[in-house]
Amino acid sequence: KESCDVQLYIKRQSEHSILAGDPFELECPVKYCANRPHVTWCKLNGTTCVKLEDRQTSWKEEKNISFFILHFEPVLPNDNGSYRCSANFQSNLIESHSTTLYVTDVKSASERPSKDEMASRPWLLYR
């Protein structure tokens, strides 16, 4: 029988390389049975995880899984770092593994990368 516990499917040591100045969606895959849990995002600061209260979030529902999304409009250099989502479910707090954003600010470099450079650096093409 399938477990009806809430599960958060962020892979251990997952990471995203992204560009400052782009929109970005950080997804927390959430599996639940009946009632959708209350999910929040936080950003790691040393040993504590600071809740992101003022940020735009949304739910995306798919057939077998839902995604709680943290939106960046746009990504900023100080968004660099590790994030975690957590769910409150029947008085239990379930925490995900952390996922790390590596933010490159091409505008602080002397020149923005060309399309050819982008093609040779596919890690930048995160979507």
Partner: antibody, heavy 125, light 108 residues
Amino acid sequence: EVQLVQSGGGLVHPGGSLRLSCAGSGFTFSSYAMHWVRQAPGKGLEWVSVIGTGVATYYADSVKGRFTISRDNAKNSLFLHMNSLRAEDMAVYYCARGFYYGSGTNYYNRGMDVWGQGTTVTVSS
Amino acid sequence: EIVLTQSPGTLSLSPGERATLSCRASQSVSSSYLAWYQQKPGQAPRLLIYGASSRATGIPDRFSGSGSGTDFTLTISRLEPEDFAVYYCQQYGSSPYTFGQGTKLEIK
């Protein structure tokens, strides 16, 4: 004067292709995200696509896999390449300026604050 | 996606009256990312309000926006003849960047 001037559009058969262009002037084009929004005859506004100041692109589900947004910052130009056009794609298409990102924490997001004049795409056999 | 529902669909008022337009979201929208636009026939939309309550450049102070979470309001304190148009709300913090279906403000 800050403005967006659109070109392209016209009549195309179902399954056909079209490219829309949008030229920006009076502002630092490369520092702004850019959007396409459309409006079918007698209907409301529908967001189509956005491109950030880097490489990120996002699309409405209705056009994903058929439309491609791109930009040429050297020419202050935004493009929408539309393939496999359908009757439901028939609309006035607008380009619009989105968030500003300079560098560091130099940014703001005021929605779509400058719009092009619109260009009509007619899909008919 | 975040669905925005505007009400009423049509609002019939006279010049000089006060107009109150509502926009309700299916999920919470950060007030930083809620805008209102005005559109007249044959014209492109024009940004009126961004960040739920900030007036865009050149917009008269009779236009004001308020609200947070899932409920937002555009108020036109004293209608001028040029204010009769269609008004759209939009959330722009979450892709897809959805618009409401519009409220038509017509002369009574």
